[in-house]
Interface confidence: medium
């Protein structure tokens, strides 16, 4: 069983899923309002968003006291965060600016990918090996959307029987999408295109918030019960509480290299020939050059106009 990394508003913690009754280890303490969290295992980096400080920060998890600011301007409520461990990019949602943005892992070369028809975007999940990203929106027209990680091919994949879609996670091996709905109190799964939808846990969960997966087990945080729960990802059986009495459980991830499988990085050689951003794409050549917001890509499709 994995270590589970979760945001707890005041801190980030790690708890062993097999021994959840033990105290969790504080990875980073003294935070204001940590909401979303993710990591790049191969780089030893943990990222989180703080919705009170309106910032995204990171730390090296094998070093103490190494907190760095990554994004500190232009954020209002960065509720969702995801690391592209393959293309070495950072993606985030902001439910107040109503944007989904991308940048390098150090926060540089920031680009707004989506800014229209977003209401309350929350969870975001990446599948870098296929070039797709997924996010939930619990606004007036709740939905789950999919798009290329380069901002292309945006498509609504779930928009029925959905109310407060909070948690979202991908099963890379089985090619499945799982999500938790806090209003309808369930966990459902589907194919990555939204087809073949099935219930995993029917409407009995008080307030599921964030969701992750490791091997055959789903793990999620629940706001109402202040705990982390788990069940079998196929059947929903074996539903149990594995870690309780959490101050304010927010985002959660199975903290393991297994959750960030290696694959060919189409941007790996010479940044794909791109002068600035090289983003994963679902269509050949499986990457797309891009420029920071406000800077134009020249007709060669590789170079950003001077001044970026």
């Amino acid at each position: 069983a994995p270590l589970l990394l979760y945001a707890n508003r005041r801190d980030l913690r790690l708890v062993d899923a097999t021994n959840g009754k033990e105290n969790a280890t504080i990875v980073v303490g003294g935070l204001e309002d940590a909401a979303a969290v993710d990591f790049v295992f191969s780089h030893g980096l943990i990222y989180w968003s703080d919705v009170s400080e309106e910032a995204i920060k990171r730390t090296e998890f094998n070093k103490t006291e190494s907190v760095q600011n990554v994004v500190v301007s232009g954020l209002l409520s960065p509720d969702g965060l995801a690391c592209d461990w393959l293309g070495e990019k950072l993606y985030w949602t902001d439910s107040e600016t109503n944007r989904i943005e991308v940048s390098n892992l150090d926060g540089s070369l920031r680009k707004v990918l989506f800014w229209q028809e977003l209401d309350q975007p929350r969870a975001i999940a990446l599948d870098p090996s296929s070039g797709f990203m997924y996010w939930t929106d619990w606004g007036e027209v709740p939905k789950i959307e999919r798009a290329g990680m380069d901002g292309s091919s945006r498509f609504i994949i779930i928009n029925s029987e959905i109310y407060w879609p909070n948690g979202l996670t991908l099963d890379y091996e089985e090619q499945k999408l799982y999500w938790a709905d806090a209003k309808l109190n369930f966990i459902h799964k589907s194919n990555l295109d939204g087809t073949n939808r099935q219930a995993v846990v029917k409407g009995s969960l008080p307030h599921p918030f964030a969701l992750t997966l490791f091997e055959d087990i789903l793990y999620w945080t629940d706001w109402s019960t202040h705990s982390i729960l788990a069940c079998n990802k196929y059947t929903g059986e074996g539903l149990r509480e594995i870690h309780s009495d959490i101050f304010s459980p927010m985002d959660i991830h199975a903290f393991s290299q297994q959750r960030q499988p290696n694959a060919t990085n189409p941007c790996g050689i010479d940044n794909g020939g791109c002068s600035h951003l090289c983003l994963m794409s679902p269509v050949k050549p499986f990457y797309q050059c891009a420029c920071p917001t406000g800077v134009k890509l020249l007709e060669n499709g590789k170079t950003c106009k001077d001044g970026a």
Partner: antibody
Framework: QVQLQQSGAELVKPGASVKMSCKAF????????IEWMKQNHGKSLEWIGN????????KYNEKFKGKAKLTVEKSSSTVYLELSRSTSDDSAVYYC??????????????WGQGTSVTVSS | DIVMTQSQKFMSTSVGDRVSITCKAS??????VAWYQQKPGQSPKSLIY???NRHTGVPDRFTGSGSGTDFTLTISNVQSEDLADYFC?????????FGGGTKLEIK
Amino acid sequence: QVQLQQSGAELVKPGASVKMSCKAFGYTFTSYPIEWMKQNHGKSLEWIGNFHPYNDNTKYNEKFKGKAKLTVEKSSSTVYLELSRSTSDDSAVYYCARGYSGNYFSAMDYWGQGTSVTVSS
Amino acid sequence: DIVMTQSQKFMSTSVGDRVSITCKASQNVRNDVAWYQQKPGQSPKSLIYLASNRHTGVPDRFTGSGSGTDFTLTISNVQSEDLADYFCLQHWNYPYTFGGGTKLEIK
């Protein structure tokens, strides 16, 4: 509709224990915590603690640890508050309320009518 | 513990007036503040959650504002039925704490 029904007024002798109830109607009992408050006759409200019927998780205000005990009877959707070793300081009205989670907040939305406790010999 | 201070214990107003009741937190509580109304002989009733959001069924003459440490409940066009005690609550950190209350009196 959502309703919390509290047990009737109690007259308690000093040193004795008193147990009051809060019965929930009109919603899924295990989906929400029950919060308990004390209101002195001087009108200020104090949070005693909460009980979540989904996982029996209990949180107490340090001030009331050893004084208050929260328990549940799930079959009747009832949460109980027991006060031990009563003193005149425990004379007050005790309210239960449903702890409500919206999708980015929690607060107390529905309140019981209150149980008045008087400690007197 | 976080202390919520309602400095005005009593406020006097007339029907049709606008009145603002304030609450100050001893530390930053973001916007995790709720307001409750308690009429004589009744239990508290939820008015405002998350500092500025009206609960279902609450008249729009009740408005909440503020974040961080300073919060205000404003009642515009005061009605005689608004005679009550008003409490603020912070649920940013345990233990949850209430303000001491402000009694609204109608002249």
